[in-house]
């Protein structure tokens, strides 16, 4: 097991600094996400004239991006942890088809378009490590999200940037939602 | 863990954490052969699963997590004598700052965490 250099492994002492708890760890994933995120959307407004857009209400009819909400118990008012916790795993697994979608939408950002894929699963698993009640989690179904990624690729070429930027902007929104939740757990 | 294995052969080593949870912790395989520096052959981080390999053990060793273990593990394939040396995991957070560099994740000044190593001969 991995010991401070010079440590006799069988009496595991922190280092210098203290080992990160599980809320600190999370709370950095999430920042590391949305640092990524802010990466992405500065080539999508680089790129075309969608985030001064005022015509999102027609691309976002195609879409069902997740959403926190008051019943969902992540607001000061009315929160539960429990209940939030798992709007927030649930919704991140419902963000995966459309991060899945991103993946070929950007020229000079790719890397990090796969980053803030990837990071996104290893938050779920940090997430899903945390949460009790795993049972109250919905995974959604594979086949409609390769029919929903089969008809977002279908669009034209306006909607698809429309679309990538309705995604940043909403993972953007739910996971600054999310940190905030999670630092009242 | 380590041993004795043959030219060919393969071996498996395991990291685990005792006092922290390795899941949050980028993770680095070192070795020292005999007489040589410390090098870093291969790491992975926390933040986006990242992997990286020294030339030497490119396409021969893989790197990997198991979260339902807390565990990182290096898969040495077709193992030759010039592996042999002593093998230590290490751990840190030099990947927490999106954008890092992964293949400076070899510097052993990264990491907070060390463990005692394990010794590997390649010898028929």
């Known amino acids: 097991a991995p010991v401070p250099p010079g440590e006799d492994s069988k009496d595991v002492a922190a280092p210098h600094r203290q080992p990160l708890t599980s809320s600190e760890r999370i709370d950095k994933q999430i920042r590391y996400i949305l640092d990524g995120i802010s990466a992405l959307r500065k080539e999508t407004c680089n790129k075309s004239n969608m985030c001064e857009s005022s015509k999102e209400a027609l691309a976002e009819n195609n879409l069902n991006l997740p959403k926190m909400a008051e019943k969902d118990g992540c607001f000061q008012s009315g929160f539960n942890e429990e209940t939030c916790l798992v709007k927030i795993i649930t919704g991140l697994l419902e963000f995966e088809v459309y991060l899945e979608y991103l993946q070929n939408r950007f020229e000079s950002s790719e890397e990090q378009a796969r980053a803030v894929q990837m990071s996104t699963k290893v938050l779920i698993q940090f997430l899903q490590k945390k949460a009790k009640n795993l049972d109250a989690i919905t995974t959604p179904d594979p086949t409609t999200n390769a029919s929903l990624l089969t008809k977002l690729q279908a669009q034209n070429q306006w909607l698809q940037d429309m679309t990538t930027h309705l995604i940043l902007r909403s993972f953007k929104e739910f996971l600054q939602s999310s940190l905030r939740a999670l630092r009242q757990m | 863990g380590g041993g004795l294995v043959q030219p060919g052969g393969s071996l498996r080593l395991s990291c685990a954490a005792s006092?922290?949870?390795?899941?949050?912790?980028?993770v680095g395989w070192f070795r020292q052969a005999p007489g040589k520096e410390r090098e870093g052959i291969s790491c992975i981080s926390s933040s986006d699963l990242k992997t990286y390999y020294a030339d030497s053990v490119k396409g021969r060793f893989t790197i990997s997590r198991d979260y339902a273990k807390s565990t990182v593990s290096l898969q040495m394939n077709s193992l030759k004598p010039e592996d042999t040396g002593v093998y230590y995991c290490a751990a840190g957070t030099w990947d927490l700052k999106f954008g890092y560099n992964i293949s400076a994740c070899v510097g052993s000044y990264e990491y907070d965490y060390w463990d005692q190593g394990t010794q590997v001969t390649v010898s028929s």
């Open positions: 006092g922290f949870t390795l899941d949050y912790y980028a």
